[in-house]
Amino acid sequence: WELTILHTNDVHSRLEQTSEDSSKCVNASRCMGGVARLFTKVQQIRRAEPNVLLLDAGDQYQGTIWFTVYKGAEVAHFMNALRYDAMALGNHEFDNGVEGLIEPLLKEAKFPILSANIKAKGPLASQISGLYLPYKVLPVGDEVVGIVGYTSKETPFLSNPGTNLVFEDEITALQPEVDKLKTLNVNKIIALGHSGFEMDKLIAQKVRGVDVVVGGHSNTFLYTGNPPSKEVPAGKYPFIVTSDDGRKVPVVQAYAFGKYLGYLKIEFDERGNVISSHGNPILLNSSIPEDPSIKADINKWRIKLDNYSTQELGKTIVYLDGSSQSCRFRECNMGNLICDAMINNNLRHTDEMFWNHVSMCILNGGGIRSPIDERNNGTITWENLAAVLPFGGTFDLVQLKGSTLKKAFEHSVHRYGQSTGEFLQVGGIHVVYDLSRKPGDRVVKLDVLCTKCRVPSYDPLKMDEVYKVILPNFLANGGDGFQMIKDELLRHDSGDQDINVVSTYISKMKVIYPAVEGRIKFS
């Protein structure tokens, strides 16, 4: 019996087609993805093949103005239109709190939403009961397939699930649910979830009875053969894991941002054992037509976005200096504003010992593309912020050793004075440079804000200590020459859309007046 699994993950609000790098579509003839194009390909495959499941492995939420404005209603609407069969909860589904998940998505989705390792307690337990499930048995042709969900247990540090949801260890939580499916005579089981490729492989290895793992969170690109675009494969598709009980378990992921549609064909024997598996992600490039009816619906929903981008988010009573003459040479108040917003967006008081789990921010000055003048009645709009942060990036959470941070700050000024983008703006960090010293030895003082303290204060950076830092995904990926970050990071979790982080902060503060306050000094 053959099953076709079509899968997406980490779509992050890319409802419209995008450029090849998943930013805003500029030249339509070269654009990719989007739900209208995805629908065309899904329908084509459904037409051709008998047993097709369309699955999403989480993180539909967060990433573009679509999510900022529609807050998840767009996800439910268009996933319903594409007739998804199931979705796993990702960490970003909790970005607007549990209410922001329940109302727009859980109550509106016409497909099951899954996670076996999230347990509700207290008053939330009855409120959320039945709105998401640990597993679902789906009829597919003449057979049934069990889908069991999972979500990153780091979600409380990455999003806003509140205090009434407990995120358990994935493997511990999955095993009893899979066992239950087996007792129900379900012998074909897919683990669908959002914990990253390393955990996907562990689930394949450790959870008895799981036949296939469809994952997300780590934006992993797998491919067999010559890859069709810029993404470099992390391995073959599917990635085969040998389970502890000797089975060959295919593990798949389909990069991110709706650029690819994962396509996996699985052949099962009559006892539900995987006989063979093959496939590849399908690049959704512009040669695949956008479905006109879905496209028309997108255009209808778009109208509200255009109106939103010119509305006032808040006010500034000072000039927000985002000029390259400032931000690439010295501390600039636009850099301070953005870093403060980045830290504020990551406030998660999850432990009495820590006032927060993260206190530090770094931001490449070259990523700040425009100032905002306060003389326009002080008004700040989404449109203004899009000029400051035009690249559609995210502000991510990483864990780095102090020694890596020291290297990053040396790199920040290794060729100082040439207006290059690697000069770092900061938050929760005090740095002093001596430019008279040779490159690679210019950081003379580097103090960082403590987290394990009731009264935050600045302490010298410890080379062997592991620190959490918020930074643009561009830096996490080694951009602007920060190869040491990419090579040495110990953990990397994708965060929220850059503009969304700053806009939320400005809306919260109502009036802002960031200063230049001695975060970066030259001796």
Epitope: R47, A48, S286, I288
Partner: antibody, heavy 121, light 107 residues
Amino acid sequence: QVQLVQSGAEVKKPGSSVKVSCKASGYTFTSYGLSWVRQAPGQGLEWMGEIYPGSGNTYYNEKFKGRVTITADESTSTAYMELSSLRSEDTAVYYCARYDYLGSSYGFDYWGAGTTVTVSS
Amino acid sequence: DIQMTQSPSSLSASVGDRVTITCKASQDVSTAVAWYQQKPGKAPKLLLYSASYRYSGVPSRFSGSGSGTDYTLTISSLQPEDFATYYCQQHYNTPYTFGGGTKLEIK
């Protein structure tokens, strides 16, 4: 290399049936669609229907309302098109053509050489 | 059914000429349009797919454009081997339909 080899020319009486074969080689038969297209003498092209050999799913042009049946034999990588209740207007060259539904080429990328069917009393 | 209206039905041109053939669909076919070249006694050959994508091995003098209902095939500089009949086809909805063809003849 990809090849679609069709059966030889046929002469048929009105009211009878014809079954044309198309043997595929050089690719995975079950991973592509196969369409049948005909061309009457001096005329344009007309799509008759398609089959997806992996599933056996078939779709037909309503114009042929029940007269056409498309089948596939996975074991021999061969597709068949049977047209019944033949009339003189069915005199045409019948082509099979491959369709890559998993790729992005929206069109028929490989064609058979064609089979001439003549309907005459 | 979606009608594909191709024009002109015949065209005389010389080697080196720039030639344009148009195809109008009776409804939006969302770039799901292919163009074929057919020579007498031969099967059609795929030239362009998805309105503007050249099929592998097709010379760069062949180009396509269009969206919605209007599509164009352009041959930038006619070569002797280009004299043939050209068909457009919509691959958006079944029944897939072809244009009536454009016979390109030598002037």
